[in-house]
Interface confidence: medium
Amino acid sequence: VPRWRQQWSGPGTTKRFPETVLARCVKYTEIHPEMRHVDCQSVWDAFKGAFISKHPCNITEEDYQPLMKLGTQTVPCNKILLWSRIKDLAHQFTQVQRDMFTLEDTLLGYLADDLTWCGEFNTSKINYQSCPDWRKDCSNNPVSVFWKTVSRRFAEAACDVVHVMLNGSRSKIFDKNSTFGSVEVHNLQPEKVQTLEAWVIHGGREDSRDLCQDPTIKELESIISKRNIQFSCKNIYRPDKFLQCVKNPEDSSCTSEI
């Protein structure tokens, strides 16, 4: 008799999930000498242990602690780039500006980027059919709890000037419900972080508005100021030119506003 299986609203575990996590771990530790000591077998065991045989709506940050411990990594605390709803450009930026880091440039962020995973209560199976959706099913699912945990730790580690890239094409440029708005903003440490500098990325070619005056940006400024952290904001009118000028700062066209 086929066993009844919980049907969730979200997509199931990414195909070849174990192999992908392992492959990414091996690749990352080969490329980053400071992480060569990491044993990818132990990393996989800790990752698996966080969600296998557990109810996928009952995952806690505590479940991920063994993985967090294994993935402990020191990144320069004054070179952190947060992002919200504009991941691709943030990643393109840190690929060029190699001394800056997004969460996905760290081992744990890199392992899980773009992946979905969940298990089933009381079985050692990975559920490839469906996983809980954050809105429709539950927020304490394996993926959401993972990102909440690593995002909190990443924000807590930041110091000096922290940058955040925001998507100026969205109706809510700053969204309180995003990971940045709900987790990272509230875990920046005022005793370490002097300034949060927002880069608002413009979508339209002819968009010359000052999006730093957007009501949601003012809301972000208010939240940050109340936490005794200074706030500054810059419009990035031409993201393509911005990346080009990061690559070639000597270019004569890079002295004008981007």
């Epitope: 070849r16 174990p18 192999e19 992908t20 392992l22 091996v26 690749k27 044993d39 990818c40 773009d114």
Partner: antibody, heavy 125, light 107 residues
Framework: QVQLVQSGAEVKKPGSSVKVSCKAS????????ISWVRQAPGKRLEWMGW????????TYVQKFQGRVTITADESTSTAYMELSSLRSEDTAVYYC??????????????????WGQGTLVTVSS | EIVLTQSPATLSASPGERATLSCRAS??????LAWYQQKPGQAPRLLIQ???TRATGIPARFSGSGSGTEFTLTISSLQSEDFAVYYC?????????FGGGTKVDIK
Amino acid sequence: QVQLVQSGAEVKKPGSSVKVSCKASGGNFISYSISWVRQAPGKRLEWMGWIIPIFGTTTYVQKFQGRVTITADESTSTAYMELSSLRSEDTAVYYCARVKYGSGSYYPNNWFDPWGQGTLVTVSS
Amino acid sequence: EIVLTQSPATLSASPGERATLSCRASQSISSNLAWYQQKPGQAPRLLIQDSSTRATGIPARFSGSGSGTEFTLTISSLQSEDFAVYYCQQSDNWPLTFGGGTKVDIK
């Protein structure tokens, strides 16, 4: 530095089986995939499949499905490839190779580095 | 499966000359291509991965380029030890497949 050392040449009769070994040294055997690639005389290199020792999972190319079995012994850091129901066209040099991960936005690319020295399997009546 | 076609089948050149080898994929494979060198009686050796990244210890005279369906391996100045067979391999899609090879021999 990882090194892969394969077992010696074999001469087999049609219909029989052959088992080739590949011993790894100088690296973390369990976390890497070990692939098997063959090269028949005058033919292109042909990927047969692989094993990921940490999971014990295997992937076989459809052409070899049902005839090839890839296994690994973690205790001796050795991978094995067994090919059954041998025919003359299976005469080839069989290589094991460790999978090296390259770039790739989702699943890192799979390249082969390093390779074993190769094992010549001759199928003849 | 993705078919890789290499050309020319044989390239005759002299030491010091520039050699350009081509690999064409039957469908787009992004930059998911590698090049190997194989000398008689030896196993293949990884030269280039991810279309253009030289593998560890590979001399700078070897370079790779291309994306999509057209790829090139260039040897800027052939040395005596470079006369060998060169294979391309794709990792975009399973099964992983190799090209038929280009033999670079001495003119």
